[in-house]
Interface confidence: low
């Protein structure tokens, strides 16, 4: 009698490893013999497909060499024209050892940002992914999480997160390890110890100290009043990612010193700054307080101005008086480069004789100050415009201290040659006869605060300013 097909052995789930054989059995009872077809994921398997073997009148389907892509739902359908077609389905579970398809890579990240180390896996059963840092399993916390994809996400990266990482993919068939990768945490430059401001006496040695850290270790540069430091010695040391820089300065003028710590992150830089001011304590000490000794001038700057083999006063309040006083003259002299040709020779004479004062040897060597009259001649005649500009800058606070006045005496505090001709020194370069002096035009619109007396004539002039030149 004709009998509709009945599947007596329903398909079961088949587990198979890659490259193994997998067989589905679909036992059918019917009369007449049924036609059996097979589908995978609802797509018909063709009889001539060489990857499959269909035997026992279609009741056995064999996959000859299982591939990862063979997983899916396999169904057999039996039909003999009697009654309806019958179907049974089962799954092929392609079992696969874990495989890391997208391994982690080395990462450089700035502290505080988010880092993601990839670790994409394949395998069946689905591998569980864990991570190892150094030699220990990595513990997840509020910042550190293993994502569903297997990737490691670290929020708000910290310095201590730096190290060697590898991911581990594990299932019942085995374990796969990624290569070891490095997470490098870079840290913006930061100043740990800022240089301190100082108020010192002229000619002092001061050490400014600046300490910075960062990853990579920053470099430190020093800036003086907006420009790269031109003088002074810099000593640096690096220990445990901390750079220590010491700038030793010989103080001849006030300034703003800035320590700049810089490090590089890829194409970008991070910078930290700290500044300190160096100011000079008030200079106008009474001359009698000075302590020092007489010595022949051996410098270079004032050679043309001071008399040959002149005996000058060297002030022992400096560690090295000769060097300190020469440096002071040199600093002031550089500023004279921009003054007028009328002012410059007079100002050079004044500052050389003021800094390297004539010395009176004796039991107590004494400096002989410049006579007031000569000082006023420079201030009110030769350098009137320049003096005004300088005083205006001082009043407006453009100079941080009286430094620029140090190289120029306060005329009113100097002794007059009319009180005691031996108590003060003359500037031979400014000696004129009365006739010449009368021809000087007023060089400022303001009336001189002090009447300028006649300067006595002197035959010891090494140069003179021609009256004709002075009048133009």
């Amino acid at each position: 009698l004709p009998k509709a097909p009945v599947i007596t052995t329903p398909l079961e789930t088949v587990d198979a490893l890659v490259e193994e054989v997998a067989t589905f059995m679909c036992a059918v009872e019917s009369y007449p013999q049924p036609e059996i077809s097979w589908t995978r994921n609802k797509i018909l398997i063709k009889l001539f497909d060489t990857r499959y073997s269909i035997r026992e009148n279609g009741q056995l389907l064999t996959i000859l060499s299982v591939e990862d892509s063979d997983d899916g739902i396999y169904c057999c359908t039996a039909n003999n024209g009697v009654g309806g077609a019958v179907e049974s389905c089962g799954a092929l579970q392609v079992k696969m050892k874990p495989k890391i398809t997208r391994p982690p890579i080395n990462v450089k990240i700035i502290e505080g940002l988010k880092a993601v180390l990839p670790c994409t896996t394949m395998g069946n059963p689905k591998p569980s992914v864990s991570w190892i840092k150094g030699d220990s399993p990595l513990r997840e916390n509020s910042r550190i999480a293993v994502l569903e994809s297997g990737s490691l996400r670290i929020h708000n990266v910290q310095k201590e997160d730096a190290g060697q990482y590898r991911c581990v993919a594990k299932n019942s068939l085995g374990t796969a390890y990624s290569k070891v990768v490095k997470l490098e945490v870079e840290v913006f430059a930061r100043i740990l110890r800022a240089p301190e401001s100082h108020n010192v006496t002229f000619g002092s040695f001061v050490t400014l100290h600046c300490t910075a850290t960062g990853i990579p270790v920053p470099t430190i540069t020093w800036i003086e009043n907006g420009n790269a430091v031109s003088s002074g010695s810099i000593q640096e040391s690096v220990k445990d990612r901390v750079i220590d820089s010491r700038l030793q300065l010989f103080i001849t003028k006030p300034g703003l010193y800035t320590c700049i710590a810089t490090n590089k992150h890829g194409e970008k830089f991070s910078t930290a700054k700290a500044a300190a001011t160096i100011s000079i304590a008030e200079w106008s000490k009474p001359q009698k307080d000075n302590k020092g000794y007489c010595a022949q001038y051996r410098g270079e700057v004032c050679n043309a101005v001071l008399a040959k083999d002149a005996l000058v006063f060297l002030n022992t309040s400096y560690a090295d008086p000769e060097e300190a006083q020469e440096l002071l003259v040199h600093t002031a002299w550089n500023e004279l480069k921009v003054v007028s040709p009328v002012c410059r020779p007079a100002a050079e004479a004044l500052l050389c004789n003021h800094i390297f004062q004539e010395c009176s040897p004796g039991v107590v060597p004494t400096p002989i100050p410049i006579c007031r009259e000569y000082c006023l001649a420079v201030k009110e005649l030769f350098c009137a415009k320049e003096w005004l500009v300088m005083e205006e800058k001082t009043h407006r606070g453009l100079y941080r201290s009286e430094m620029h006045l140090l190289s120029v005496p306060e005329c009113s505090k100097l002794p007059s040659m009319h009180w005691d001709p031996t108590a003060c020194a003359r500037l031979p370069h400014l000696d004129y006869n009365k006739e010449n002096l009368k021809t000087f035009p007023p060089m400022t619109s303001s009336k001189p605060s002090v009447d300028i007396p006649n300067l006595p004539s002197s035959s010891s002039s090494s140069f003179s300013v021609s009256p004709t030149y002075s009048m133009t």
Partner: antibody, heavy 126, light 107 residues
Framework: EVQLVESGGGLVQPGGSLRLSCAAS????????IHWVRQAPGKGLEWVAS????????SYADSVKGRFTISADTSKNTAYLQMNSLRAEDTAVYYC???????????????????WGQGTLVTVSS | DIQMTQSPSSLSASVGDRVTITCRAS??????VAWYQQKPGKAPKLLIY???SLYSGVPSRFSGSRSGTDFTLTISSLQPEDFATYYC?????????FGQGTKVEIK
């Protein structure tokens, strides 16, 4: 990090309506299927409905067919359950859950619900 | 609809015990069975899918097996955190169904 967050629960009278939302994040919503499962106080789990975000196909438990509608807005990564003609026996904590996704067809086909929201309470009472 | 009959409805066990929970499907569901753990006031957690595949991150003391339409969840050595209610679930048809649950209590 995969997250599902339900909202929209509350107290409603019999015959009333309520719309539950399930906001998803941390996975590809458009290639997943979302399920609603409920649990009456002190009882077991009961599957309610499901939607495949990619195809839009839906399924419903017999107990809610014709009264509840499941939908999804892939642009907002959100699934919804519109509940009409509510009855006292609909009182439950409603969970949304994601069907396990795998690169293996069989594992997805046979997969369970691997991520669940925290649940939202729906009380139907006069 | 496919019915999932779970047994026992509750059991008492001690830490270290081997615990077995079974589920029987009313018709063939192939291997489309999953197991869940649920603790009071919390959402269920997936333990096993595809009848015997251990879900990622689940301790290896949990295992699943199938024999025809009978499905078993085994906890090889019960731990204090394992006291909870366990559910089986089939997804062979588009209409999913759960077992009624098994409550595992401390003896």
């Amino acid at each position: 990090e995969v997250q599902l967050v339900e909202s929209g629960g509350g107290l409603v009278q019999p015959g009333g309506s309520l719309r539950l939302s399930c906001a998803a994040s941390g996975f590809t919503f458009s290639s997943s299927s979302i399920h609603w499962v409920r649990q009456a106080p002190g009882k077991g789990l009961e599957w309610v409905a499901s939607i495949s975000s990619s195809s839009g196909s839906t399924s419903y438990a017999d107990s809610v067919k014709g009264r509840f509608t499941i939908s999804a807005d892939t642009s907002k990564n959100t699934a919804y359950l519109q509940m009409n003609s509510l009855r006292a026996e609909d009182t439950a904590v409603y969970y949304c859950a994601r069907k396990y996704w795998s690169q293996y067809y069989w594992a997805h086909y046979y997969g369970g619900l691997d991520y669940w929201g925290q649940g939202t309470l729906v009380t139907v009472s006069s | 609809d496919i019915q999932m009959t779970q047994s026992p409805s509750s059991l008492s066990a001690s830490v270290g015990d081997r615990v077995t929970i079974t589920c029987r499907a009313s018709q063939s569901v192939s291997s489309a069975v999953a197991w869940y753990q649920q603790k009071p006031g919390k959402a269920p957690k997936l333990l096993i899918y595809s009848a015997s595949s251990l879900y990622s991150g689940v301790p290896s003391r949990f295992s699943g097996s199938r024999s025809g339409t009978d499905f078993t969840l085994t906890i090889s050595s019960l731990q204090p955190e394992d006291f909870a209610t366990y559910y089986c679930q089939q997804s062979s048809s588009s209409l999913i169904t759960f077992g009624q649950g098994t409550k595992v209590e401390i003896k």
